[in-house]
Interface confidence: medium
Amino acid sequence: KVFGRCELAAAMKRHGLDNYRGYSLGNWVCAAKFESNFNTQATNRNTDGSTDYGILQINSRWWCNDGRTPGSRNLCNIPCSALLSSDITASVNCAKKIVSDGNGMNAWVAWRNRCKGTDVQAWIRGCRL
């Protein structure tokens, strides 16, 4: 599923991401935009043999199990395919674990490069939340 901007903002708010670990909703929507272009079925392969999955491009070396990533830790204890569902519950739950890990949203390269220090509230402006 490819979410609309405000549709995703509403879904993320419903799942408790607004101000989760101090990160406003705009940060999460911005991250999703530049990680997956709001596409729940996005997959991207990395040079280390791992793959990033879903709307928040969660990595198979650390967070989920795709059955084929060397040394996978599967810290979210889920199959990576669950992160590709049109229901973002699994992605959100895993993202909560990632953002609590110590580096906050710096774990997402796209957030670090495209969202951090910008007017992230623009990503939810005009949305009826």
Epitope: Q41, G49, G67, R68, T69, P70, P79, L84
Partner: antibody, heavy 116, light 107 residues
């Protein structure tokens, strides 16, 4: 136990298309990538590409883009590979395998012969 | 693409001999290298994963070693059932690639 059952041998005319199937049993089909591999005598094994049945995500070896198309039917736990515009170069044995990085589980292979 | 070069192309041995098959990668692939045996008209069979991890059910006479670019499959005291083709395969990056194979034949 994990099994991959491929469709039977095919004899096709040049220019035609063919669809090969791979039925998976014994594991959660949507969770693992299905890979496709080509084998021609004297050409070894070639990786064609892969599909993640749960999402339909696909990746193709550049060499096979436009030649192969992958689909999957999660209701029947079956992956498919369609090969188009067949030529004699496409005559080969085609395998599906479960993508664990390594390939512990293989189909028995489908022999495709392209001949006028 | 990562190229895998296997040598020798053919190895003629007598049952009871010990042999080593080589697989060389065009760039470093860490330990992401796997070995297969294939007999005529059969699907490949996984022997060794991640360079040195013998798969369940594979006899202990098969062993793998190496890291980076140079890898070896060793068969200690070859048995008649071991004759056939041997392929290496890398999973370090895409596209996945295979070596050209080594044919192990009876002398």
């Amino acid at each position: 136990q994990v099994q991959l059952q491929e469709s039977g041998a095919e004899v096709m005319k040049p220019g035609a298309s063919v669809k090969i199937s791979c039925k998976a049993t014994g594991y959660t089909f949507t969770t693992y990538w299905i890979e496709w591999v080509k084998q021609r005598p004297g050409h070894g094994l070639e990786w064609i590409g892969e599909i993640l049945p749960g999402s339909g995500s696909t990746y193709y070896n550049e060499k096979f883009k436009g030649k192969a198309t992958f689909t999957a039917d999660t209701s029947s736990n079956t992956a498919y590979m369609q090969l188009s515009s067949l030529t004699s170069e496409d005559s080969a044995v085609y395998y599906c395998a479960r993508g664990d990085g390594w390939y512990c589980y293989w189909g028995q292979g489908t022999t495709l012969t392209v001949s006028s | 693409d990562i190229e895998l070069t296997q040598s020798p192309a053919t190895l003629s041995v007598t049952p009871g001999d010990s042999v080593s098959l080589s697989c060389r990668a065009s760039q470093s692939i860490s330990n992401n290298l796997h070995w297969y045996q294939q007999k005529s008209h059969e699907s490949p069979r996984l022997l060794i994963k991640y360079a040195s991890q013998r798969v369940s059910g594979i006899p202990s006479r098969f062993s793998g070693s190496g890291s980076g670019t140079d890898f070896t499959l060793s068969i200690n005291s070859v048995e008649t059932e071991d004759f056939g083709m041997y392929f290496c395969q890398q999973s370090n990056s895409w596209p996945r690639t295979f070596g050209g194979g080594t044919k192990l034949e009876i002398k």
